[in-house]
């Protein structure tokens, strides 16, 4: 059976501006090898091109001219002696896209063109986007190895010029930025930043780029306690806050961590082990009591670590007024006054406006004071009958107000009753 | 340090909606609240409402609970704030703050005018 | 909702002069209130958080204090920027809320 010029090639190939293609190729031509064995030769040509004096565009013929624009660009892969007439573009421009024809020589018999069999090349705008790799997850401190790649790019052509860029950079030196792998140390701030790598090849307009968010995972550093959305002062990892007895009190506490860390409060100082009374980073008091004084913890528990803040509560009241009330007993009139306050309250006598300090000199009054707890007690001793109506007031006060209260003693020694007198400092 | 840029002045017609946003940079996003604020002209300060940008948790002033919806947007380190059914009482300049125990930082203010 | 009553609303004062600003309290909001500066151009910045603790920055010609319900901001000698407006703003309950302000004049 005679061997006849046969060309095996896809009709047409669509390749992406830059991007690289493999055409599979293979042919047969008739060739009988009784003598002389002459060298084969097979050429790729633009369509249209007459093959005796035309550049070509691929040949393993090292005395034809090759296109310019196609050297190093379009190769023969693949063994010609083989009939393997595969074709391998690199950096595809847009100018390549056109028709091509195959062509084998081989002595003075074989000398053909496949005309019927033309390769149609299309060369499209550049949509491919670069693949960022890297071992996930990112852990904020320990450096990671990035990488960056085009898939279906190759070497052929001028070089691939990378930049990256994203906040996570910011300390790396321009060089580092320049190359297809950088080595990235992650920060917890650079957790949800984008980092973009984008390709370029040089001499070439043709750039790409993909972005990728940066999942940062990163133990709390900071723990913060919000009062209706406004931070609290931190002073050695303690927050202190005065609150009102019986005022609702209902803080937020918050560590920022990747993945959430798990917030809970707890009562006091706790062990590592012990039971919280919010599994939230709220913390609601409805009304808080003086026996919440001291304290609450808010901890930040988390698979890289664990934090923990001590909120530091004082429980405090204004003054509250028992009295005054007073009775004639031997020793002349007696008066008494009690206060309940946190802070306990300082208190002050005054007779007709006039304050009674300590005890008189002449030995006219004498006051004595004693505090238990919350409570402040006083008692105001006068001594002699009164001559005239009097006005005697006792007034308690503390840091976060005061409260007076008064009797009006009438001549006769009789009281006309008790007034209580609320007052702020 | 710190700075919260927020978004160019905006005119509205009533009855319209608007969204406003406070990019932050400069620090961890979602570790501080955001809380934003309205001035009217020439008047005092009121307090919207805020948000927590890592839990999404809010909280409003009743008085702009059906007008005013906080969110955060972490990836962009973003605060919105949408305003819905605007009347020329909603004309003010709105600002978002952030709280930290170490200090507050402002935006410079949105200026929103309703008119028709 | 806690109001805070601030006086005066505008105070006419020389450079170098000490001045007072006062912010009542309708409620008890216990160490919970701040001080805020807002410039003309609208610039607004913390002065004072949690009643006395100057923020970072913050000249130390002020300071803030309390009596009971009254919390005051003092400038102790006037200087030519602390002539703009002053807002007191109380997070002791929601919603905050803030004094209606204190216009400072040079005179």
């Known amino acids: 059976e005679k061997p006849v010029y046969e060309l095996q090639v896809q009709k047409s190939v669509t390749v992406q501006e830059g991007l690289c293609v493999l055409v599979p190729c293979s042919f047969s031509y008739p060739w009988r090898s009784w003598y002389s064995s002459p060298p084969l030769y097979v050429y790729w040509f633009r369509d249209g091109e007459i093959p005796y004096y035309a550049e070509v565009v691929a040949t393993n013929n090292p005395d034809r001219r090759v296109k310019p624009e196609t050297q190093g660009r379009f190769r023969l892969l693949g063994d010609v002696q083989k009939k393997n007439c595969s074709l391998s573009i690199g950096d595809a421009r847009m100018e390549d896209t056109g028709s091509y024809f195959f062509r084998v020589e081989r002595g003075r018999d074989v000398k053909y063109s496949y005309q019927q069999n033309k390769l149609n090349l299309e060369v499209t705008a550049l949509i491919e986007k670069p693949d960022i790799h890297f071992l996930e997850p990112l852990e904020s401190g320990r450096p990671t190895r990035l990488s960056c790649s085009l898939p279906g790019s190759c070497e052929a052509g001028p070089p691939l010029t990378f930049s990256w860029t994203g906040n996570a950079l910011s300390p790396l030196d321009p060089e580092t930025t320049r190359s297809s792998e950088l080595t990235l140390t992650p920060r917890p701030e650079d957790h949800g930043t984008n980092l973009t790598c984008q390709m370029k090849r040089q001499g070439a307009q043709v750039t790409t780029e993909r972005t990728v968010q940066l999942n940062v995972s990163y133990a709390p550093q900071t723990i913060t306690i919000f009062r209706n959305g406004i931070a609290l002062e931190i002073l050695q990892n303690t927050s202190y806050l005065p609150v009102l007895e019986g005022q609702a009190l209902r803080l937020l506490c918050d560590a920022p961590s990747n993945p959430p860390a798990h917030l809970s409060w707890f009562q006091g100082s706790p062990a590592l082990n012990a039971t919280p009374i919010s599994n939230t980073g709220i913390l609601e008091l409805r009304r808080v009591r003086s026996a919440e004084e001291g304290g609450f913890t808010c901890r930040a528990q988390h698979p890289l670590g664990f934090l923990q803040i001590f909120l530091n509560l004082s429980v405090y009241s204004l003054p509250q007024l028992l009295g005054p009330s007073c009775s004639w007993e031997a020793e002349g009139l007696h008066c008494r006054c009690s206060f309940r306050a946190r802070p306990a309250p300082s208190l002050c006598w005054r007779l007709e406006e006039k304050p009674l300090e300590g005890n008189s000199s002449q030995g006219s009054f004498k006051v004595n004071s004693s505090s238990a707890g919350p409570w402040a007690n006083s008692s105001l001793i006068l001594h002699g009958g009164l001559s005239s109506d009097l006005k005697v007031s006792c007034k308690a006060w503390n840091i976060y107000g005061s409260q007076s209260g008064s009797v009006l003693l009438l001549q006769g020694r009789s009281n006309l009753g008790t007034g209580v007198v609320p007052a702020a400092l | 340090q710190a700075y919260l840029q927020q978004s160019g002045a905006e005119l509205a017609r009533p009855g319209a909606s608007v969204k406003m946003s406070c990019k932050a940079s400069?620090?961890?996003?979602?570790?501080?609240?955001m809380y934003w604020v309205k001035q009217r002209p020439g008047q005092g300060l009121e307090w919207i409402g805020y948000?927590?940008?890592?839990?999404?948790?809010?909280e409003y002033n009743q008085k702009f609970k059906d007008k005013a919806t906080l969110t955060a947007d972490k990836s962009s380190s973003t605060a919105y704030m949408q305003l819905i059914s605007l009347t020329s009482e909603d004309s003010a300049v709105y600002y978002c703050a952030r709280s930290d125990s170490k200090g507050d930082y402002w935006g410079q203010g949105t200026t929103l005018t309703v008119s028709s | 909702d806690v109001v805070m009553t601030q006086s005066p609303s505008s105070l006419s004062a020389s450079l170098g002069e000490r001045v007072s600003l006062t912010c009542r309290a309708s409620q008890d909001i216990g160490n919970s209130l701040n001080w805020l500066q807002q410039e003309p151009d609208g610039t607004i910045k913390r002065l004072i958080s949690?009643?006395?603790s100057l923020d970072s920055g913050v000249p130390k010609r002020f300071s803030g204090s309390r009596s009971g319900s009254d919390y005051s901001l003092t400038i102790s000698s006037l200087e030519s920027e602390d002539f703009v407006d002053y807002y007191c703003l109380q997070y002791a309950s929601s919603p905050l809320t803030f004094g209606a302000g204190t216009k400072l004049e040079l005179k």
């Open positions: 948000i927590n940008p890592s839990s999404g948790y809010t």
């Open positions: 400069g620090y961890t996003f979602s570790s501080y609240t």
């Open positions: 949690a009643t006395s």
